[in-house]
Interface confidence: medium
Amino acid sequence: MGVPTALEAGSWRWGSLLFALFLAASLGPVAAFKVATPYSLYVCPEGQNVTLTCRLLGPVDKGHDVTFYKTWYRSSRGEVQTCSERRPIRNLTFQDLHLHHGGHQAANTSHDLAQRHGLESASDHHGNFSITMRNLTLLDSGLYCCLVVEIRHHHSEHRVHGAMELQVQTGKDAPSNCVVYPSSSQDSENITAAALATGACIVGILCLPLILLLVYKQRQAASNRRAQELVRMDSNIQGIENPGFEASPPAQGIPEAKVRHPLSYVAQRQPSESGRHLLSEPSTPLSPPGPGDVFFPSLDPVPDSPNFEVI
């Protein structure tokens, strides 16, 4: 066969790299959904209503035995792991506020229990889920966490959470309406990465045979023209372009990506990206927890506790 030329080796290297990249994209993110928080900070005046929102992103398994447990709770700042401590929201535990359904389905918490506390959590068909807090007081200020657990038949499979800050203000400095601050660009980049990975997964699966064919043809053409390529290698090697690996120009179309801009917030329902409003009709009833029920005050495993499995 002889020693491969620089071009042949190069084209094969590109092919292998493309193959590896698409294989990784195809296999990598299949199981991993994410939670995005469109806004990381909500600043509201006392007495106002606010809707905190999270969004389920990425591939969602719609298997018959797969359901999603979505809930809300409060946590505290300065922890090693954000959202690891689970505190109630207005005396309602995350169990009281939970939604349960398959995939991107709509759901609501029971009205009677939550509404007595001025709360309502809801979920729509597009992966958005939210908690609405009515008549805010200074005591409502703090870190809020949304949690999504994928459950296959009884057992938990995958767990993700999102965090956001609520600041309730009073006095002359308080805004007249809620003001929301978008999540930092890093969060956005992570979300974009998740979306891209999902896209790459689909593209990867579709393009894999095409890439393999191209690589094979490249190799064949390269070996057939080895003599000519050796002669003209110096002049051609700098002209090799691979559209799949062009350096991306700086994103000029996104101004002030690193700056957090407050957005005026109308204190009703948060619309979803599709323009639809979150559902407000009650879905399935949820009884308040009885005295014998288990709670999950923290993520620390409880030794030999038979009533639950800490996830």
Epitope: D65, T67, Y69, Q95, H98, H100, H101, G102, V149, I151, R152, H153, H154, H155, S156, E157, T284, P285, L286, S287, P288, P289, G290, G292, D293, V294, F296, P306, N307, F308, E309, I311
Partner: antibody, heavy 122, light 112 residues
């Protein structure tokens, strides 16, 4: 304490249906799975299926699909299992049992009912 | 379906002796979340089953420490260190990792 009270024994004709009940007390009915298990002499225990009353989800053993229908009434904290097109093969003791907590359970059945005997005979 | 095979079918013991019951699954019962949902139940004559052990080796609340579970993958064992009269009955192993959950055929613990 946590209890599951099952309905009494049933003597039914072949080809008919029967609906047996399981009333839960001592815990929040909507927060736990509730399963059904069949026991026939010489056949051991068989999982029929389970229901999550809080969301109305059901899981069935393929073997019992079309035979058993699981429902729950959250207002009375009662689960039901209807068995249709009964034959002598359906003569057995049927247990209801509380499954794990919805949010990632460690086990299947921690509390069992006393069982309901169903006899199919002409 | 995952087939759970228990041995022996019958286990005659003297009170105070150690008893050991084996349970083998037809495939690995490690759940995709990393846990192994293998349980042991005891059914006394005329009663409903009672949970003894969950997740291979965890004793359920109120279960005496003479009961212990062990094993991994496809092979599991229940040991009773000193058999008492109240331990007599049929022992069932059960897997909850795969749908449908399945029980073993049972092992009858009886007095020799």
């Amino acid at each position: 304490q946590v209890q599951l009270q099952q309905s009494g024994a049933e003597l039914v004709r072949p080809g008919t249906s029967v609906k047996i009940s399981c009333k839960a007390s001592g815990y929040t009915f909507t927060n736990y799975w509730l399963g059904w298990v069949k026991q026939r002499p010489g056949h051991g225990l068989e999982w029929i299926g389970d229901i999550y009353p809080g969301g109305g989800y059901t899981n069935y053993n393929e073997k019992f699909k079309g035979k058993a229908t699981l429902t729950a009434d959250t207002s009375s904290s009662t689960a039901y299992m209807q068995l249709s097109s009964l034959t002598s093969e359906d003569s057995a003791v049927y247990f209801c049992a509380r499954g794990g907590y919805y949010y990632g359970s460690s086990w299947y059945f921690d509390v069992w009912g006393a069982g309901t005997t169903v006899t199919v005979s002409s | 379906d995952v087939l759970m095979t228990q041995t022996p079918l019958s286990l005659p013991v003297s009170l105070g002796d150690q008893a050991s019951i084996s349970c083998r699954s037809s495939q690995s019962i490690v759940h995709s979340n990393g846990n192994t949902y293998l349980e042991w139940y005891l059914q006394k004559p005329g009663q409903s089953p009672k949970l003894l052990i969950y997740k291979v080796s965890n004793r359920f609340s109120g279960v005496p420490d003479r009961f212990s579970g062990s094993g991994s993958g496809t092979d599991f064992t229940l040991k009773i260190s000193r058999v008492e009269a109240e331990d007599l009955g049929v022992y069932y192993c059960f897997q909850g990792s795969h749908v449908p959950p399945t029980f073993g055929g049972g092992t009858k613990l009886e007095i020799k």
